[in-house]
């Protein structure tokens, strides 16, 4: 399980890297933020941290309330300062890893951090 | 009734240390980012640092960068500037500020205190 | 990091006067710009936020307009309290958070 974590955690803040540069992996990092209502991997400050993004923005996904621009120059009581790995993770241990095996590819592909029919399962819970 | 009150300015010989503080007032301390902004004698207003709500987010204008230090203390409701290795060009009114970010601008000002670095 | 130019750097004007002050962003800004009023001596004043919002309590004579690099604040008709210095300043990206240089408004 602690590998499996650990591989989400690496992949995750790696498709932050991307988030600004591939719509498509921004669009899934902008599903499970709002979904699972979490901002970065660790935490929000993450985002401070990719070098494209400007230093004062999270994407609008971390928002409590989203709306296009919410995201820019944030204060941090309208943003959801949780961490994604350790939420999804928390989801992840309980709902899924004791209902199937996850082999690293679930979690692991290319653009691909948790399968749609995961998130469409949390989104409907 | 919101206020900013800033203490801490006063004469200092080049090189020196000096410790500004802000206390709040009026409003939930917690819900602002807080800003440093001096104003030289005669010249235009400088940012100098924020600090976050929670105080996990800190950044400064690169003339003051590893000389000052910002730090908050919510639970007094209170706002400080360290600032050490002073130059005559750290000369200023600095004003302690009330940010809530987004769009909203810089609403509150303290009336701002003096810093003089002279030999 | 985004410069911002005002213009003019000082103004003559006469009480009932219209003016008008513009703010050039280096790079878009949308409509992340303030406009603040300062008095000699006092603390500056936040008059106009997100480009053209009338700060509470500012009187209606105020108003800005403009986004992406260009942007003004008029004073519709000049009232002897509003000969001040007036600066723009941008929270679209920072840090830095940067300010114009300040124009100042003078009776003619």
């Known amino acids: 399980r602690d590998k499996v974590m650990s591989e989400f955690n690496n992949n995750f803040r790696q498709q932050m890297e991307n988030y600004p540069k591939n719509n498509h992996t921004a669009s899934i990092l902008d599903r499970m933020q709002a979904d699972f209502k979490c901002c970065g991997a660790a935490n929000y400050t993450d985002w401070e941290k990719i070098p494209s993004m400007s230093k004062n923005r999270v994407p609008d996904s971390c928002c409590i309330n989203v709306t296009v621009g919410c995201g820019i120059n944030f204060n941090e009581k309208a943003i959801h300062k949780e961490g994604c790995v350790e939420k999804i993770g928390g989801w992840l241990r309980k709902n899924v890893l004791e209902q199937k095996l996850i082999s690293e590819e679930d979690l692991g592909g290319e653009q691909k951090l948790i399968s749609e029919e995961d998130l469409h399962h949390h989104h409907h819970h | 009734q919101v206020q900013l009150v800033e203490s801490g300015g006063g004469l200092v010989k080049p090189g020196g240390s000096l410790r500004l503080s802000c206390a709040a007032s009026g409003f939930i301390f917690t819900d602002y980012f807080m800003n440093w902004i001096r104003q030289a004698p005669g010249k235009g207003l400088e940012w100098v640092s924020y600090?976050?709500?929670?105080?996990?987010?800190?950044y400064y204008a690169d003339s003051v960068k590893g000389r000052f230090t910002i730090s908050r203390d919510n639970a007094k409701a209170s706002l400080y500037l360290q600032m050490s290795s002073l130059k005559a060009e750290d000369t200023a009114v600095y004003y302690c500020?009330?940010?809530?970010?987004?769009?909203?601008?810089?609403?509150?000002w303290g009336q701002g205190t003096t810093v003089t670095v002279s030999s | 990091d985004i410069q911002m130019t005002q213009s003019p750097s000082s103004l003559s004007a006469s009480v009932g006067d219209r003016v008008t002050i513009t703010c050039r962003a280096s790079?878009?800004?949308?409509?992340?710009l303030n406009w603040y009023q300062q008095k000699p001596g006092k603390a500056p004043k936040l008059l106009i936020y997100?480009?053209?919002s009338l700060q509470s309590g500012v009187p209606s004579r105020f108003s800005g307009s403009g986004s992406g690099t260009d942007f003004t604040l008029t004073i519709s008709s000049l009232q002897p309290e509003d000969f001040a210095t007036y600066y723009c300043q941008q929270s679209y990206s920072t840090p830095p958070i940067t300010f114009g240089q300040g124009t100042r408004l003078e009776i003619k």
């Open positions: 600090i976050s709500n929670s105080g996990n987010i800190l």
């Open positions: 790079q878009s800004i949308s409509s992340y």
């Open positions: 997100a480009a053209s």
């Open positions: 500020v009330r940010d809530p970010r987004m769009f909203y601008g810089m609403d509150v």
